[in-house]
Each structure stands twice: as structure tokens, then as C-alpha cells.
Interface confidence: low
């Protein structure tokens, strides 16, 4: 710190006093000097460091009519809302000619009720799950001892005997309040009261019970929920593209999920109105009167394939002698899976039914046995997926080919000598 020289007497006729008070106090430090000639600018030091942004005012009063006469200079430093950072040794400093003069020191101290640097915060925790709360207070005067309270009941016999800055709670089964008291020689300050809301634990073991093409039955194990019974569980399902990238930690799915509520128990739910042969991701959360648990991680599931829901459309069957030409279009109804092909069955009035697998073609030419005199020949077609056959079309009678009708050339399919198996006729 700058030092005054001994060559000249100090100009200070009034030195800063002392201030001791509680946080938030407003006070003023003053120093006064008498100088000859032009009044100097007064600076303030705290602990030897110049206060560049000090809230100070300077008043100058001439003691004579001549500018070279003596002046009284008063500098006042205002401290608003006293904080710990304001404490220390204060001095005034002036430059007079080539000399530096420093006043005698004054002291600013802080003493009062404890002040909280950190208080317990409201939070939600899962039932029976450890967590910790923080509380930190300081004086002066030190020491500051803390006493934690749960639901207004002290957790130790006396301040300073229990947990101090951090309270470890091994788990709660009901929503509780926590606060801490800070004690020092001046008295007691009480922190805010934090409400710790006990939510159900995250459900576990989310799994599939059964699968249908348009519905999935899922079950899970509920977590503990403390003294609060679960009111319901909420299940979300979302279509999962290959690139959607739902991962365990990802907070939200990319599109609006399908949400269903399940009353509990049982901890089971049938999710309907799903697309067949489609991958989904599902998750579940359970709710008590205190609020919902966290979601489980997303679980990838898939609906199985179903059979086509309708028969092939626009079936036409024409006959020319010993050949029959049949063609059709894909079913308009949902296929519920990957179309693997078509089955065709034909039968005459007094002949056994013949069943054929046509594959994915939508037309076929049949080579009929005999002289073509089989009467009342009818044809039915069904589409199939890996899950099985869809419904058969209504029997379509074979119409005689009329000259002028185009007869496309098609690969001939020989009728098998005996049916592979019999199909119920309509």
C-alpha cells in the first residue's frame, strides 16, 4: 500500500471510523483533510487496494477568498447493503504535490444472524430412493452450526451434532418437508422449507405378454410408491422408423405417441388399433396422487403379420375350349403384412376341387383336362402372407370365350393329376 512520507505533516484531520453490522446494513465512512491551494481528489483503499468504482462523494469548502488559501475537503464513502465482500480495512488516499498521504484506517465488519449461502430446494424423488439436500450458512460471527429439520422435527439433538452442509436421506415413503436452522452467537436463522415430493419409482420389467397383428398386450412390474397407492399407469407407443434412433436416454419420441391409460392393478394393458407387421417403441410410467414416475426406457416391440383382410378384386375368368384364362387385382383391403402370393381354386359341378399356388402373378392360363365339356366351372382366388390365407373371393363362373375377345398368350399351367389337398367348397 502507498505510504505517506515523513517530510510533511499528514493533511488528514478526520479519519474513517469503524462500522460493524449485519448484512444489508447501509453505512458511510468519512475522512476530512485540510490543504493549502487547489483541493486534491480523494481516493479510497480497501485492504490496500484502490476502489476504482467506489460510491464516494467529495465536498470542498474554501477557508479564505483566495484560491491559494486553505481548503477543507470531505470525502464520504457510502456502503449500501453490507455484504461479506465489503468487510476489511478502509483508508483515504491523496496525492499532494509529489507526496502520497494515507489516512489512519477504519474497519468495516460484518456481524449478525447467520446468512444462508445455500438453502434446501423443492424437488421430487422416487420412493425409497436415496438423495441429498444442501444447506450452507455463514456468519460472522463464526462458527455457524446447522440443525436439519424434517417435517418440523429436528434430526439431531443439538445444532452442529447432526449432518451439516449436506443431509443424506436414505429414502422417503411419503412427501416431506425439510428445512435447516443456522445458529451462531447472535441467534438463529431458519432457511426456506423445501418440499420433497415422493413419486412412484420407475416401473421395471416392461415386456410383451402376447402379440396380435393389430394389438399388443404388455405387462410391467410397478415400482414402490411409498404410502400413496398408484392411481393409474400411462403407456406410450410410437411408430419407430429405422432411422428414428430412440435411445434409452432420449427424452421424447420424434412424433406424437399413442397414449393409453391403464387402471391398476393389474399392471397389464392391451394396446389396440396398431398397424400389423410394424415396429413400435413403448414405455410406461405410473402415477400416484403425488405425481408420475419417470418413464421406463423405450422398449422396441413389433406387431406380427396378419392375413389379408379381403379377397383379390376384379376377378375375371374366360374359357376357350380346354383353356381358361383368369386374372385379378390385389385386394383393396389391408394386406396386414407382405404379400407372398395368391392361391386359386377351381371346380366343376361334378368334379373335385383343384387348388393351386400361383405365386405373385395376377393372371394364369389353365389347361383343363378332358374335352372341355365340364359344366358350371367356377374359380376362387385368395391372397396370402406369411401369417396365412386371406378370405377367398366369391366363386366366379367361367364365361365362354367369344370371337373378337382378345385372348392373351400366357404360360400354360397344367392341372395336377390329383388335387394336392381338398378345399371346402362354397
Amino acid at each position: 500500500a502507498p505510504r505517506g512520507t515523513q517530510a510533511e505533516e499528514s493533511p488528514f484531520v478526520g479519519n474513517p471510523g469503524n462500522i460493524t453490522g449485519a448484512r444489508g446494513l447501509t453505512g458511510t465512512l468519512r475522512c476530512q483533510l485540510q490543504v493549502q491551494g487547489e483541493p486534491p481528489e480523494v481516493h479510497w483503499l480497501r485492504d490496500g487496494q484502490i476502489l476504482e468504482l467506489a460510491d464516494s462523494t467529495q465536498t470542498q469548502v474554501p477557508l479564505g477568498e483566495d484560491e491559494q488559501d486553505d481548503w477543507i475537503v470531505v470525502s464520504q464513502l457510502r456502503i449500501t447493503s453490507l455484504q461479506l465482500s465489503d468487510t476489511g480495512q478502509y483508508q483515504c488516499l491523496v496525492f499532494l504535490g509529489h507526496q502520497t498521504f494515507v489516512s489512519q484506517p477504519g474497519y468495516v465488519g460484518l456481524e449478525g444472524l447467520p446468512y444462508f449461502l445455500e438453502e434446501p430446494e423443492d424437488r421430487t424423488v422416487a420412493a425409497n430412493t436415496p438423495f441429498n439436500l444442501s444447506c450452507q450458512a455463514q456468519g460472522p460471527p463464526e462458527p455457524v452450526d446447522l440443525l436439519w429439520l424434517q417435517d418440523a422435527v429436528p434430526l439431531a439433538t443439538a445444532p452442529g451434532h447432526g449432518p451439516q452442509r449436506s443431509l443424506h436421506v436414505p429414502g422417503l415413503n411419503k412427501t416431506s418437508s425439510f428445512s435447516c436452522e443456522a445458529h451462531n452467537a447472535k441467534g438463529v436463522t431458519t432457511s426456506r422449507t423445501a418440499t420433497i415430493t415422493v413419486l412412484p419409482q420407475q416401473p421395471r420389467n416392461l415386456h410383451l405378454v402376447s402379440r396380435q397383428p393389430t394389438e399388443l398386450e404388455v405387462a410391467w412390474t410397478p415400482g414402490l410408491s411409498g404410502i400413496y397407492p398408484l392411481t393409474h399407469c400411462t403407456l406410450q407407443a410410437v411408430l419407430s422408423d429405422d432411422g428414428m434412433g430412440i435411445q434409452a436416454g432420449e427424452p421424447d419420441p420424434p412424433e406424437e405417441p399413442l397414449t393409453s391409460q391403464a387402471s391398476v392393478p393389474p399392471h397389464q394393458l392391451r394396446l389396440g388399433s396398431l398397424h400389423p407387421h410394424t415396429p413400435y417403441h413403448i414405455r410406461v410410467a405410473c402415477t400416484s396422487s403425488q405425481g408420475p414416475s419417470s418413464w421406463t426406457h423405450w422398449l422396441p416391440v413389433e406387431t406380427p403379420e396378419g392375413v389379408p383382410l379381403g379377397p383379390p378384386e376384379n376377378i375375371s375368368a374366360t374359357r376357350n375350349g380346354s383353356q381358361a384364362f383368369v386374372h385379378w387385382q390385389e385386394p383393396r383391403a389391408p394386406l396386414q403384412g407382405t404379400l407372398l402370393g395368391y392361391r386359386l381354386a377351381y371346380q366343376g359341378q361334378d368334379t373335385p376341387e383343384v387348388l393351386m399356388d400361383i405365386g405373385l402373378r395376377q393372371e394364369v392360363t389353365l389347361e383343363l383336362q378332358g374335352d372341355g365339356s365340364v359344366s358350371n366351372l367356377t374359380v376362387c382366388v385368395a391372397a396370402y402372407t406369411a401369417a396365412g390365407d386371406g378370405p377367398w373371393s366369391l366363386p366366379v363362373p367361367l364365361e365362354a370365350w367369344r370371337p373378337g375377345q382378345a385372348q392373351p398368350v400366357h404360360q400354360l399351367v397344367k392341372e395336377p393329376s390329383t388335387p394336392a389337398f381338398s378345399w371346402p367348397w362354397w
Epitope: N128, P130, N132, H168, P170, G171, L224, Q247, A248, G249
Partner: antibody, heavy 117, light 107 residues
Framework: EVNLVESGGGLVQPGGSLKLSCATS????????MYWVRQTPEKRLEWVAY????????YYPDTVKGRFTISRDNAKNTLYLQMSRLKSEDTAMYYC??????????WGQGTSVTVSS | DIVMTQSHKFMSTSVGDRVSITCKAS??????VAWYQQKPGQSPKLLIY???TRHTGVPDRFTGSGSGTDYTLTISSVQAEDLALYYC?????????FGSGTKLEIK
């Protein structure tokens, strides 16, 4: 001074059983959740079980679920691990440890379990 | 299960050096990460919990940092007695899982 001392390890045949104990001192045992952790011969650490301070809640990983049972006697300040249907992959050094903000702040010196025919 | 990956099985350093041991979680573990030191022939000892809180009695040359999935244990000035295996552990979700360990060797 916090002290945890495991015992009960040894050589056992596959399918056999063993009961480990962990005697504790130097802290209020009934205030703390406790763990069993094992360290394989390859030095890999695996959490085996944990139990709440009152003993009402226990948790196990799938690797030991249904075969191992953690328990405690707060009057005796002792933690136990009953191991049954032991497999060769259960061969390890078994440590008991005290829970501190979900981390393990004090560990015992360990007891060795060898499952071999 | 959450997988904790310590990509360096071994790290070689000299006394006085600064060294950082890393650990990556397979998902966000919200700073619920602890670090342990295991010296030869001893049981593991807790160094850091909640990613950055130093356990009682641990020298201040050990610091922990990180968030989300990436965590680091830093020894600001390695001492000869720091020769040990260092493990990370997530205590975010059961089953609590450990990294496979990083062996710190002194040159």
C-alpha cells in the same frame, strides 16, 4: 474409524452354497445402505447386491437374481450374502461396502470365493 | 444396462505430470459418476462422487469433471503413490456398473 471385515469365502463346487459375512464397526450401521461388490480374477468390478438401511429393500443384477440373497442384522452390525447354485463365473473376491450418495465410500479387505470342481 | 467405457487400459506418466483418465457412459447418467482408486493388493477406495465431489481425505490434486455421457478424472501432478488401477462407476441406475479400469503406470 470405519471398519468392514468380510469372512466366509473359500473353495466350493459348482452348484454349491456359501454364506459370506461382513462385520462392521466405527459407524451407525443401521443408518446406511450396504452393498456387496465382487472383483473377478480379470480385475473387473461387478455390483452384486444392495440393501436398504432397515433391510426392507434389496436389489440384485440379473446375473445373480434368484441365487444370491443379501440380508443384515442391525443388532449385530453385520451384513450377509447367501450364495447358492454357484457357478464358475461367480469366482471372485467379494467386498462389502458402505453406501454414500450412491457411491461406495468404505470397502472391506475382501474375501475370496473360488467355484471349481 | 448402462455400459461405462474406459478406452485406455493403460496410461503411462511421469511424476509431476498432469494426467486425465476418461470414462464414457452409454447413455446420459446426469453426473451420477464415482471414481475409485485400487492400489496393488488393496481394496478400492472412493476418490470422487457425483462426478466432481471429492471424498473426505482425498488430496486436492484429484479432480473430477464431466456431464451427460463423458467424465474425466484428472490428477494435476502425479505422485509415485498414485500408481494404481482407476475405475469409474455410474450410480444413476441399477444395475450400477463399473468401467473396466485404467492402470496408471509411472515411467
Amino acid at each position: 474409524e470405519v471398519n468392514l471385515v468380510e469372512s466366509g469365502g473359500g473353495l466350493v463346487q459348482p452348484g454349491g452354497s456359501l454364506k459370506l459375512s461382513c462385520a462392521t464397526s466405527g459407524f451407525t450401521f443401521s443408518d446406511y445402505y450396504m452393498y456387496w461388490v465382487r472383483q473377478t480374477p480379470e480385475k473387473r468390478l461387478e455390483w452384486v447386491a444392495y440393501i436398504s438401511n432397515g433391510g426392507g429393500s434389496t436389489y440384485y443384477p440379473d446375473t445373480v437374481k434368484g441365487r444370491f440373497t443379501i440380508s443384515r442384522d442391525n443388532a449385530k452390525n453385520t451384513l450377509y450374502l447367501q450364495m447358492s447354485r454357484l457357478k464358475s463365473e461367480d469366482t471372485a473376491m467379494y467386498y462389502c461396502a458402505r453406501l454414500h450418495f450412491y457411491a461406495m465410500d468404505y470397502w472391506g479387505q475382501g474375501t475370496s470365493v473360488t467355484v471349481s470342481s | 444396462d448402462i455400459v461405462m467405457t474406459q478406452s485406455h487400459k493403460f496410461m503411462s506418466t511421469s511424476v509431476g505430470d498432469r494426467v486425465s483418465i476418461t470414462c464414457k457412459a452409454s447413455q446420459d447418467v446426469s453426473t451420477a459418476v464415482a471414481w475409485y482408486q485400487q492400489k496393488p493388493g488393496q481394496s478400492p477406495k472412493l476418490l470422487i462422487y457425483w462426478a466432481s465431489t471429492r471424498h473426505t481425505g482425498v488430496p486436492d490434486r484429484f479432480t473430477g469433471s464431466g456431464s451427460g455421457t463423458d467424465y474425466t478424472l484428472t490428477i494435476s501432478s502425479v505422485q509415485a503413490e498414485d500408481l494404481a488401477l482407476y475405475y469409474c462407476q455410474q450410480h444413476y441406475n441399477t444395475p450400477f456398473t463399473f468401467g473396466s479400469g485404467t492402470k496408471l503406470e509411472i515411467k
